[in-house]
Interface confidence: medium
Amino acid sequence: AHYNTEILKSIDNEWRKTQCMPREVSIDVGKEFGVATNTFFKPPCVSVYRCGGCCNSEGLQCMNTSTSYLSKTLFEITVPLSQGPKPVTISFANHTSCRCMSKLDVYRQVHSIIRR
Amino acid sequence: AHYNTEILKSIDNEWRKTQCMPREVSIDVGKEFGVATNTFFKPPCVSVYRCGGCCNSEGLQCMNTSTSYLSKTLFEITVPLSQGPKPVTISFANHTSCRCMSKLDVYRQVHSIIRR
């Protein structure tokens, strides 16, 4: 079959843009750390890089292969307000490289971490 | 309370980076359109803009207020392979503006669309 080169180029571009790689995302601080329901953060979210995008096959999953940690200062507010907003410094995982891994490998990796 | 102004600025910057706005995301074509399980797309994902980020309050949700549609050409593969990959042009929703809306308003909006 003969395909229009423009179509091939645009498809190739789509592959590139959707590949598994670190992407800037907004994460909810409270949900990330499972904090008490009477504790709030301002801002409620922080911007970090996490692995995202798509893999070429159903059996693969986009996973981080290396991680750095970013310290960010936020205001913590505890209700009832015994004091004003308190600046707190929290460390967030920041994915620096990613790879499409088989879901079985991911399962093994996660379970080996849990077992430690 | 005395606050370090550098911290105040970095906190404000975090608000900025995590605000509700159109963000480039990778979406799974098959999942987006709920296609038959024997149909695959190459690439399996496309890059579009969708509303994302955080709102200042629990009761608010980041929602699109305007949408454009992008046409993208992909290869469609149907199993068993009766023919080679077939180029198909599909239209994808691309969010162009967003707003933090109350979850009640979002519910009403979604239900008014369903009712039509």
Epitope: P43 | A1, H2, Y3, N4, T5, E6, L8, K9, I11, D12, N13, W15, R16
Partner: antibody, heavy 122, light 107 residues
């Protein structure tokens, strides 16, 4: 061209109220913090309050906390200073000033309005 | 609150003179110091930010230095338009505080 124009000053009795406005133009209003700084006749400069029009974050000098409220209307590119329970020592020229840039590490006021005089006297 | 103490409170100088104004913070303020020039009946103008960075459009005869608690504003060669009052300001913590000012007069 960046411009800040204050208005709303005048003579008011002790215990009275006044609302100052600061109309901003020539820049993206939500990209900079907006401060109010005052100067009593023949005296030095005193910082009063600040707002981030972007996030709505506000901070005040202890001398005005609970009496003054800073706010911003992003649709009008205008910051306000609502002054209640005014005292004789609040008499001053009130300037609104723009913070140099949200990306700079610290506050520094790069553009100032012409000032508006507030006189608190019976 | 952090106190900013300027010295001298006034000085007399001639055109072409090198002028130095100092500012001392009551505690460490890193490099979070700005300098302003104010003329009678006018709003202040930013000269220096973050202790040593010359603000855009400000003549290069103005310079700033220092970190921690001791800061200096220098005018290398005083010009007629430089006769004014100069203020230092710390913005390391809230509230930002100003020095009491240094009036530079014609000798």
């Amino acid at each position: 061209e960046v411009q800040l124009v204050e208005s709303g000053g005048g003579l008011v009795q002790p215990g009275g109220s006044l609302r100052l406005s600061c109309a901003a133009s020539g820049f993206t209003f939500t990209d900079n913090w907006i401060h109010w700084v005052r100067q009593a006749p023949g005296k030095g400069l005193e910082w009063v309050a600040v707002i981030s029009p972007y996030s709505g974050a506000t901070y005040y000098a202890d001398s005005v906390k609970g009496r003054f409220t800073i706010s911003a209307d992003t649709s009008k590119n205008t910051a306000y200073l609502q002054m209640n329970s005014l005292r004789a020592e609040d008499t001053a020229v009130y300037y609104c000033a723009r913070d140099a840039d949200y990306k700079y590490a610290f506050w520094a006021f790069d553009y100032w309005g012409q000032g508006t005089l507030v006189t608190v006297s019976s | 609150d952090i106190q900013m103490t300027q010295s001298p409170s006034s000085l007399s100088a001639s055109v072409g003179d090198r002028v130095t104004i100092t500012c001392r913070a009551s505690q460490d303020v890193s490099t979070a110091v700005a300098w302003y020039q104010q003329k009678p009946g006018k709003a202040p103008k930013l000269l220096i930010y973050s202790a040593s960075f010359l603000y855009s459009g400000v003549p290069s005869r103005f310079s700033g230095s220092g970190s921690g608690t001791d800061f200096t504003l220098t005018i290398s060669s005083l010009q007629p338009e430089d006769f004014a009052t100069y203020y230092c300001q710390q913005s390391y913590t809230t509230p930002p505080t100003f020095g009491q000012g240094t009036k530079v007069e014609i000798k």
